[in-house]
Interface confidence: medium
């Protein structure tokens, strides 16, 4: 395209300005440049913008319809990690903070109107993860960390004083409402990436108007990763239904039984006192928070499709390419779904030696080629094995019978679950799956760790048998309501330590 | 199928007291409000108050605060409407209504059929 | 408190007329909060629209509304003999609620 020449750059250095090309003059036309911020380890880019005006559609629906020209944000590469966002008109994006090591902006413009652009600022900032960290950190609905467009429903009630964005706990106006008060009804955060939950604060809230009050008595949980694929938080086999609040004002805590990994999150209101009112905050923290948990780069692209491999790929569209944790819709299938157990794998190269301390799977969906079956498939059972050299392999031992580990999978294809382990030197990483779903094997992966150099492995844990801990469910066995009048804090933080 | 069904007319002296119930069925008592409306002879409607049945948390209007009392009782989805120092003007009908399906903007779709007071010596 | 006056208070038609009554707010109300009920003699109110505009169960479209800030109108496209009783209109945008005065609807 005739603008598009040198547009594109990377950003390596502390902190820095990215701005549309010309600024503070109207941008060209016909433009598609990539901006790249690239962050060493235990570093979290920080994205701030001052300007911004773009070209959009005045009978835009919603945000991210944008039709002419637009701003893509991405965690990692461009079209390989996920989409945080798409950007147009005159609304400023809310600042972004990033731990994924690469964030992205892809900037488009057409053949026409051209405005202002946009002026963004970046900062590196050092962060070094506690080894005692507790993942019970409020996630910004009450500081407005999280920001109003990352904030949406099924509907708003009509007269514009219960909207979403009135739903932060402690809000002193209102709360949200929708249209009209059904179980159909739903809240929705976008945490912009994934994160680990592992509570929920829920308050009431009194009208403004008529002095009367209104508050949610039972809610269930729904999580997506990509805000398509939804699962019904369950306790056993049923949907779990959370106890809520009693009256319009109290806040009442609800604990996880054990963390999810999510992007989105929606309350889904089951009961209520007089009509639906909410206000909330969530708890929790980023994957990266614990010590040696980087990500290492399936998700954000750094590792190259020809760095992931397996045993066999059922056809083009479920190679192992498609095996990226969260930004693939699709995932690995092997070519026989219903193989025999550890006979398939899906291996990724880190391209140099890392520390691993864990690994994050998720299921896939994808088709049967000869049924036309959009096949919806996860592994319920797994082993990992490593090596340094991609020859000699090790498999992480289950330290009290000193076979290969069998680790928990998942229980859904979309829902993703950590599995941590003791430190093991690695650059090559085998998963093989043992059991799976009925619509057989169905993968997509992470794997966490950090540079050899930032926690160097003991003597110890280079021996052949590699002690292992993997921690499942070190929660409390039920979840549980507790009010918790003006601050909610967590009375036995232990309870929710990172898996 | 929601029903509010209220009690008899009633005829009481100037300085008398009525209490007049409502009987609700077909939804839970305990999840909504109940209000309460006079309507005067040949006159309008005029609104005298409301109890949130959960908590027993009451307001009243200016005008019939101090001589109304909203109350109810759970165990048998039974809203009352009690009225003291009772003078001429008091003659009306009293509905008890309910908001279920509007509950922010108190549309009343369901109402009582209505109890006639009449004070007089 | 927010007054409701209507108008007319009273006014005489024949079937198939079209019938429109007003309703003033001595301050602004949202749309979302005022409403419309019909009376008929010895019976109680009956919802008729809710939230300016929306026709409650059952209620023929004949029957409609409209309105914002501090004006809002109920209008009868073609008068039926069901239809002469008195109307009202009703907001709870501030506590307390008030109704309307009334506006009776009789036989020319």
């Known amino acids: 395209k005739t603008g598009s020449e040198d547009c594109s750059k990377n950003f390596t250095s502390p902190n820095g300005t990215i701005e549309s090309p010309g600024f503070p003059e109207k941008y060209p036309h016909n433009l598609d440049c990539t901006f790249t911020i690239l962050a060493k380890p235990k570093m979290e880019i920080i994205l701030q913008f001052l300007i911004f005006d773009l070209e959009h559609d005045p009978l835009q629906v919603g945000e991210g319809d944008c039709k002419y020209d637009w701003l893509d944000i991405w965690d990692g590469i461009p079209h390989v990690g996920p989409l945080i966002g798409k950007y147009c008109g005159t609304k400023t994006p809310s600042e972004l903070r990033s731990s994924t090591g690469i964030l992205s902006l892809t900037f488009h413009t057409d053949m026409a109107v051209a405005k202002d652009g946009f002026s963004a600022r970046y900062y590196l900032v050092h962060q070094e993860p506690l080894e005692n960290f507790q993942c019970n950190v409020p996630l910004g609905m009450e500081s407005g960390r999280i920001a109003n467009e990352q904030i949406s429903a099924s509907s708003t009630y009509s007269d514009g004083r219960w909207t979403p964005q009135q739903s932060r706990l402690h809000g002193d106006d209102n709360g949200w409402t929708p249209n009209l008060d059904s179980n159909k009804e739903y809240l929705q955060v976008d945490l912009r990436f994934l994160t680990m939950l592992t509570a929920i604060a829920t308050q009431g809230a009194i009208s403004r108007e008529t002095q009367n009050g209104y508050y949610v008595k039972s809610y269930k949980l729904e999580v997506s990763t990509n805000g398509e694929d939804w699962m019904v938080y369950r306790h056993g086999k049923n949907h779990k239904v959370f106890q809520a609040n009693n009256d319009a004002t109290e806040v009442v805590l609800n604990k996880l039984h054990a963390p999810l990994l999510t992007r989105f999150v929606r309350i889904r209101p089951q009961t209520w006192h007089s009509g639906i009112a909410l206000r909330l905050e969530l708890f929790g923290c980023r994957v990266t928070d614990a010590p040696c948990s980087n990500m290492l780069g399936m998700l954000s692209g750094l590792i190259a499709d020809s760095q992931i491999s397996a045993s066999s790929t059922q056809e083009y569209l479920w190679s192992p390419s498609a095996a990226r944790l969260v930004s693939s819709r699709s995932g690995w299938f092997p070519r026989i779904p219903q193989a025999q157990p550890g006979e398939e794998w899906l291996q990724v190269d880190l391209g140099t030696p890392k520390t691993v301390k864990g690994v994050i799977i998720q299921g896939a969906r994808g088709g049967d080629s000869i049924t036309a079956v959009e096949a919806r498939a996860f592994v319920r059972k797994f082993k990992v094995s490593y090596s340094l050299n991609g020859k000699d392999w090790e498999y992480i031992q289950d330290p009290r019978t000193q076979q290969p580990k069998l680790f928990e999978g998942n229980m859904h294809y979309d829902t993703p679950d950590i599995r941590r382990f003791d430190p093991i030197p690695a650059q090559y990483v085998r998963v093989y799956p043992e059991r799976w779903s009925p619509a057989g094997i169905g993968m997509r992966l992470e794997v966490l760790g950090c540079d050899w150099t930032d926690s160097k492995p003991t003597v110890e844990t280079l021996g052949p048998t590699v002690k292992s801990e993997e921690t499942t469910t070190p929660y409390p066995t039920e979840e549980e309501a507790t009010e918790c009048g003006e601050n909610c804090s967590f009375e036995d933080d232990k309870d929710l330590q990172l898996p | 199928e929601v029903q509010l069904v209220q009690s008899g007319a009633e005829v009481k002296k100037p300085g008398a007291t009525v209490k007049i119930s409502c009987k609700v069925s077909?939804?839970?008592?305990?999840?909504?409000?109940v209000h309460w409306v006079q309507q005067a002879p040949g006159k309008g409607l005029e609104w005298m108050g409301r109890?949130?049945?959960?908590?027993?948390?009451?307001k009243y209007a200016p005008k019939f605060q101090g001589r109304v009392t909203i109350t109810a009782d759970t165990s048998t989805d039974t809203a009352y409407m009690e009225l003291s120092s009772l003078r001429s003007e008091d003659t009306a009908v009293y509905y008890c209504a309910t908001p279920i399906y509007g509950a922010r903007e108190a549309w009343f779709a369901y109402w009582g059929q209505g109890t006639l007071v009449t004070v007089s010596s | 408190d927010i007054q409701m006056t209507q108008s007319p208070s009273s006014l005489s038609a024949s079937v198939g007329d079209r019938v429109t009554i007003t309703c003033t707010a001595s301050s602004s109300v949202s749309s979302s909060y005022l409403h419309w009920y019909q009376q008929k003699p010895g019976k109680a109110p009956k919802l008729l629209i809710y939230r300016t505009s929306n026709l409650a169960s059952g209620v023929p479209s004949r029957f409609s509304g409209s309105g914002s800030g501090t004006d809002f109108t109920l209008t009868i496209s073609s008068l039926q003999p069901e239809d002469f009783a008195t109307y009202y209109c009703?907001?709870?945008?501030?506590?307390?609620?008030?109704f309307g005065g009334g506006t009776k609807v009789e036989i020319k």
């Open positions: 077909g939804f839970n008592i305990k999840d909504y409000y």
């Open positions: 009703h907001q709870y945008y501030r506590s307390p609620p008030t």
């Open positions: 109890i949130d049945v959960h908590d027993d948390e009451t």
